[in-house]
C-alpha cells in the first residue's frame, strides 16, 4: 500500500494523531496516539 | 451503500438567498470534510469551500466570503450552503462533495436559477 | 489562492491519437492533484488523484504525471467515448479546478 503524509488541507483532520494519505485507497487515515480512538482520534479511553 | 442526496431545484429573484441541503447516508459526516462546488451553465467547476463538521470550521473561497455560508448539523447527518445577494452569474448547479475518508464523493447537484 | 491554468482550454484529435493536458500551479502542490471527466448533463467524474493513481473502472489508456508545480495528463490512444470535458482539481491547500479541456474528435 502506497502511503503519504496528508496535504496541508487536511491539518487538523485528526484530533489525536497522524494524518496518512492511503493513496492506493483514495483516502486519508488517522494514527491515533495512545488513548484515543475513532474515525478522527476524536474519542478518549482509559 | 454511500450516498449524498441534495435538495430541489430552485428559483430565486435577484437579492435573494438560497439555502441548499446535502443529507449523508451510510456515513457519518464527522468523519468527514464537505465541499461545495458549483457549475454555472456551460462553464467551469468552481470550488466554493469547505466545512468540518466534527469541529465546526469553515474555509471559504476569497470570492464567496462574506455572501457564503456552509453549515453542518451533525445530528441529522446533514450540511448546507447558503448562498445570499443573489445575482444572475449565481445560476449554476451546485454540488456538495465529501472529501477525507474517501476522495471526493460527490452528490447529485442542486440547480439554482436567478431570474428576475 | 492557488491558481491552476490548464491548456488547451480546447483540442479537436482523431480516434487513436494520443491526447495531452497540462495543468500549472501558481506553487508547489505536492503531487495533490486530480483529474475528472465531466460529460454533458453529468456530474464530474474522477479518473486520477494524486498525480497518477487511476481510480478503479478506468481504462489504462488515461495516464498522469508530474511533480512541483507541473502535471500532465494523457489518454494514449483517444476513443469515442473519450469526447469530454476534462478537469484538473489542486487539492493540496484548500482546492482549486483548472479552467477545463474540451476534447473532440476531428
Known amino acids: 500500500v502506497s502511503i503519504t503524509k496528508c496535504n496541508s488541507d487536511m491539518n487538523g483532520y485528526c484530533l489525536h494523531g497522524q494524518c496518512i494519505y492511503l493513496v492506493d485507497m483514495s483516502q486519508n487515515y488517522c494514527r491515533c496516539e495512545v488513548g484515543y480512538t475513532g474515525v478522527r482520534c476524536e474519542h478518549f479511553y482509559l | 451503500q454511500d450516498q449524498l442526496v441534495q435538495s430541489g431545484a430552485e428559483v430565486k429573484k435577484p437579492g435573494a438567498s438560497v439555502k441548499v441541503s446535502c443529507k449523508a447516508s451510510?456515513?457519518?459526516?464527522?468523519?468527514?470534510?464537505i465541499q461545495w462546488v458549483r457549475q454555472a451553465p456551460g462553464q467551469g467547476l468552481e470550488w466554493m469551500g469547505r466545512?468540518?463538521?466534527?469541529?465546526?470550521?469553515?474555509r471559504y473561497r476569497e470570492k464567496f466570503e462574506g455572501r457564503v455560508t456552509i453549515t453542518a448539523d451533525t445530528s441529522t447527518n446533514t450540511a448546507y450552503m447558503e448562498l445570499s445577494s443573489l445575482r444572475s452569474e449565481d445560476t449554476a448547479v451546485y454540488y456538495c462533495?465529501?472529501?477525507?475518508?474517501?476522495?471526493?464523493?460527490w452528490g447529485q447537484g442542486t440547480l439554482v436559477t436567478v431570474s428576475s | 489562492d492557488i491558481q491552476m491554468t490548464q491548456s488547451p482550454s480546447s483540442l479537436s484529435a482523431s480516434v487513436g491519437d494520443r491526447v495531452t493536458i497540462t495543468c500549472k500551479a501558481s506553487?508547489?502542490?505536492?503531487?495533490?492533484i486530480a483529474w475528472y471527466q465531466q460529460k454533458p448533463g453529468q456530474a464530474p467524474r474522477l479518473l486520477i488523484q494524486?498525480?497518477?493513481t487511476l481510480q478503479p473502472g478506468v481504462p489504462s489508456r488515461f495516464s498522469g504525471s508530474g511533480s512541483g508545480t507541473d502535471y500532465t495528463f494523457t489518454i494514449s490512444s483517444l476513443q469515442p467515448e473519450d469526447i469530454a470535458t476534462y478537469y484538473c482539481?489542486?487539492?493540496?491547500?484548500?482546492?482549486?479546478f483548472g479552467g477545463g479541456t474540451k476534447v473532440e474528435i476531428k
Open positions: 506553487q508547489d502542490i505536492h503531487k495533490y
Open positions: 466545512i468540518d463538521p466534527l469541529r465546526g470550521n469553515t
Open positions: 451510510g456515513f457519518n459526516i464527522k468523519d468527514t470534510y
Open positions: 462533495v465529501r472529501s477525507g475518508t474517501l476522495f471526493d464523493f
Open positions: 494524486y498525480t497518477s
Open positions: 482539481l489542486q487539492y493540496d491547500n484548500l482546492r482549486t
